[in-house]
């Protein structure tokens, strides 16, 4: 089918375009080009007769068109008006006609844009600014850049008018930036020069420096005022409400006590019409005053609060010193001094930080000390301790339990027996106890300041007969030559003797065995596999005795160096090779084999049927104990000889 391709489709003004014809029929008489989508004699550009090779211009011919023998049409020095459709009319030799239409678009080289603004000096938090990208150009795309970045997403930024207008609502000082606009069409892109938005703002609340408000008589007073403002603020100073001068700095030499008072700085912005003031109170001392300590937290909570201790008053050109517990400050990451040493901050206070704290002001002759300050650190309650530690009593004795928990303020105590409240005292006394007094004894400690409570529960057994003891262990699976194990005989009972047996025998004498805690605890240091025995503890008093069930110690060990059996190393070709590996280990190890360094199977036995000399090599057995984390291995060389070459060789399994 006859088609027209425009090369290029988007044409820049002044350039050229080729209307390229595809699938031109054979045996042609001639062809004509027309402007538009149909054949119209009034809009003929050019005609061409093949026989005469004669080109004839038509009414729409501009002198910029060239027709080629292959029917393609070149249009040079393109103008905007050339945009649109072009129709080729082909007349075949049999006078049958055929038509095809193509098109292209003409775009101008864009002019350099510029930015116009509706407000050259917008006021912060009050005005909006609309930037418009000029000129308005047909078929152009508009983009905006802020500080050479694409537009940020903001509800205060709005694009309109086909993106040609950028509006900033409620401008802020942060909108002071470089703004550029860009125009694009398919054949060019242009960028404007930058426009800097000048936002008027302020003045903010002025800052008076230096911050210190206490001075000595005879010093110079030099105060400086600054307020963020655009344009820069105009400053005025007032002392006790009386105007002094219109300067940014106020200087008074050789001040006296009479210069004490309120000093006001006023900042004024003539463009925004706004005023802001800041007042500082200056105190002039005839002599250095006695310092005193102020605290930002009089009742700090342990491990929660920080405390800032400040040495008052603030005096210019003064050295501040600190003491804790009558010593100079210790080095600690929890102690921080401010740059001027006037403030000492204790980070995450503890109960040990109570003090006393003193600060001092150094003058020419001596150091003036403050009165000591003690911190009231609130802490606790810690877990209460119930004493005595016995859990087993005989009927008829008196039960006297005492509870204590470290706490500030001191804890309030409550006793519960089997969950039932008994009394709100620190001590619990029950005379002449019976078996019915057995149960769970709970002490509850409460700190009213922090609101925290902690409890401890103790099981009390009242019985004429001693209970059957049991053994508790601090390590159920110790590793050989590494761990220690402590066995404890439970329960702890009053006026009771504790005894131990190992495999039914009394304890052997050994430097690795140690009794402690009134023989209640048996410790085995550096356990070995030989310590894997049955341990029994016994308790006895004047009326009864009892023994625990045995506890067998499960010592983890190995793997030891493995043994490969059978021990033979020479085999005849054709025999079966059946190697077994064994290593002493608890728990049993995992086995794996390697032949000449190449991993084989993860089994204890390695079997190879009908071996040949190709099976010569090193056979390694690897053992691994996952519980101890230890490994071991052994290597065996195997030689396989051809059948009948050497007498006396093993025939294999």
């Amino acid at each position: 089918k006859l088609t027209i391709e425009s090369t290029p489709f988007n044409v820049a003004e002044g350039k050229e375009v080729l209307l390229l014809v595809h699938n031109l029929p054979q045996h042609l008489f001639g062809y004509s080009w027309y402007k538009g989508e149909r054949v119209d004699g009034n809009r003929q550009i050019i005609g061409y007769v093949i026989g005469t090779q004669q080109a004839t211009p038509g009414p729409a011919y501009s002198g910029r068109e060239i027709i080629y023998p292959n029917a393609s049409l070149l249009i040079q020095n393109i103008i905007q008006n050339d945009t649109g459709f072009y129709t080729l009319h082909v007349i075949k030799s049999d006078l049958v006609n055929e038509e095809a239409t193509g098109q292209f678009r003409v775009y101008p080289e864009l002019p350099k844009p510029s930015i116009s603004s509706n407000n050259s000096k917008p006021v912060e938090d009050k005005d909006a600014v609309a930037f418009t990208c000029e000129p308005e150009t047909q078929d152009a795309t508009y983009l905006w850049w802020v500080n050479n970045q694409s537009l940020p997403v903001s509800p205060r930024l709005q694009l309109s008018n086909g993106n040609r207008t950028l509006t900033l609502f409620n401008v802020t000082r942060n909108d002071t930036a470089s703004y550029k606009c860009e125009t694009q069409n398919p054949v060019s892109a242009r960028r404007s020069d930058s426009v800097i938005l000048n936002v008027l703002y302020g003045p903010d609340a002025p800052t008076i420096s230096p911050l210190n408000t206490s001075y000595r008589s005879g010093e110079n007073l030099n105060l400086s005022c600054h307020a963020a403002s655009n344009p820069p603020a105009q400053y005025s100073w007032f002392v006790n409400g009386t105007f002094q001068q219109s300067t940014q700095e106020l200087f008074i030499p050789n001040i006296t006590v009479n210069n004490s008072g309120s000093y006001t700085c006023q900042a004024h912005n003539s463009d925004t019409g706004l005023n802001r003031t800041t007042v500082t109170t200056i105190t002039v001392y005839a002599e250095p005053p006695k310092p005193f300590i102020t605290s930002n937290n009089s009742n700090p909570v342990e491990d929660e609060d920080a405390v800032a201790l400040t040495c008052e008053p603030e005096i210019q050109n003064t050295t501040y010193l600190w003491w804790v517990n009558n010593q100079s400050l210790p080095v600690s990451p929890r102690l921080q001094l401010s740059n001027d040493n006037r403030t000492l901050t204790l980070l995450s206070v503890t109960r040990n930080d109570v003090g006393p704290y003193e600060c001092g002001i150094q003058n020419e002759l001596s150091v003036d000390h403050s009165d000591p300050v003690i911190l009231n650190v609130l802490y606790g309650p810690d877990d209460p301790t119930i004493s005595p530690s016995y859990t087993y009593y005989r009927p008829g004795v008196n039960l006297s339990l005492s509870c204590h928990a470290a706490s500030n303020p001191p804890a309030q105590y409550s006793w519960l027996i089997d969950g039932n409240i008994q009394q709100h005292t620190q001590e619990l006394f029950i005379s002449n106890i019976t078996e019915k007094n057995s149960g769970l004894y709970t002490c509850q400690a409460n700190n009213s300041a922090s609101g925290h409570s902690r409890t401890t529960v103790k099981t009390i057994t009242v019985s004429a007969e001693l209970p059957k003891p049991s053994i508790s262990s601090n390590n159920s699976k110790p590793v050989e030559d590494k761990d220690a194990v402590a066995f404890t005989c439970e329960p702890e009972a009053q006026n009771t003797t504790y005894l131990w047996w190992v495999n039914g025998q009394s304890l052997p004498v050994s430097p690795r065995l140690q009794l402690s805690n009134g023989n209640r605890t048996l410790t085995l240091f550096n356990v070995t596999r030989n310590d894997a025995r049955a341990y029994v503890c016994g308790i006895q008093n004047s009326v009864s005795a009892n023994r625990s069930d045995p506890v067998t110690l499960d010592v983890l060990y190995g793997p030891d160096t493995p043994i490969i059996s059978p021990p033979d190393s020479s085999y005849l070709s054709g025999a079966n090779l059946n190697l077994s590996c064994h290593s002493a280990s608890n728990p049993s190890p995992q086995y794996s084999w390697r032949i000449n360094g190449i991993p084989q199977q993860h089994t204890q036995v390695l079997f190879i049927a009908k071996i040949t000399p190709n099976n010569n090599g090193t056979y390694a057995c690897f053992v691994s104990n996952l519980a101890t984390g230890r490994n071991n291995s052994i290597v065996k060389s195997i030689t396989v000889s051809a059948s009948g070459t050497s007498p006396g060789l093993s025939a294999g399994a």
């Epitope: 864009l110 350099k112 850049w145 050479n148 860009e182 694009q184 054949v187 892109a189 242009r190 960028r191």
Partner: nanobody, 123 residues
Framework: EVQLVESGGGVVQPGGSLRLSCAAS????????LGWFRQAPGREREFVAA????????YYADSVKGRFTISRDNAKNTLYLQMNSLRPEDTALYYC????????????????WGQGTLVTVSS
């Protein structure tokens, strides 16, 4: 002002590929639109491709469309031209050009030019 140095030229067989680079220094790279032009011996300087400041707009000469790709890396201050399916008629000295306010096919719109890198397409 910006200085431009082209690299990556060489001899390549027809159908082969090359990647040209243009390293910029002396100014903020993202403030310039960039273009590639070429000049074969005895011929006029010819537009190849152009890219705008942010890299979102590109423009190609019809003779290279679909075969060449222009791109830029503002973080590395570098312009690239990936040339695929090279033809003998692509043989030329390739120039990199820069403009603060223009991107397009008109060489007069670019005030800054590199020295060029030679591309030869030959079997």
């Amino acid at each position: 002002e910006v200085q431009l140095v082209e690299s990556g030229g060489g001899v390549v067989q027809p159908g082969g590929s090359l990647r040209l680079s243009c390293a910029a220094s002396g100014h903020t790279f993202s403030e310039y639109a960039l273009g590639w032009f070429r000049q074969a011996p005895g011929r006029e300087r010819e537009f190849v491709a152009a890219i705008n400041w942010g890299g979102g707009w590109t423009y190609y000469a019809d003779s290279v469309k679909g075969r060449f790709t222009i791109s830029r890396d503002n973080a590395k201050n570098t312009l690239y031209l990936q040339m695929n399916s090279l033809r003998p008629e692509d043989t030329a000295l390739y120039y990199c050009a820069a403009s603060s306010d223009y991107a397009g096919g008109n060489p007069t719109g670019y005030p800054y030019w590199g020295q060029g890198t030679l591309v030869t397409v030959s079997s």
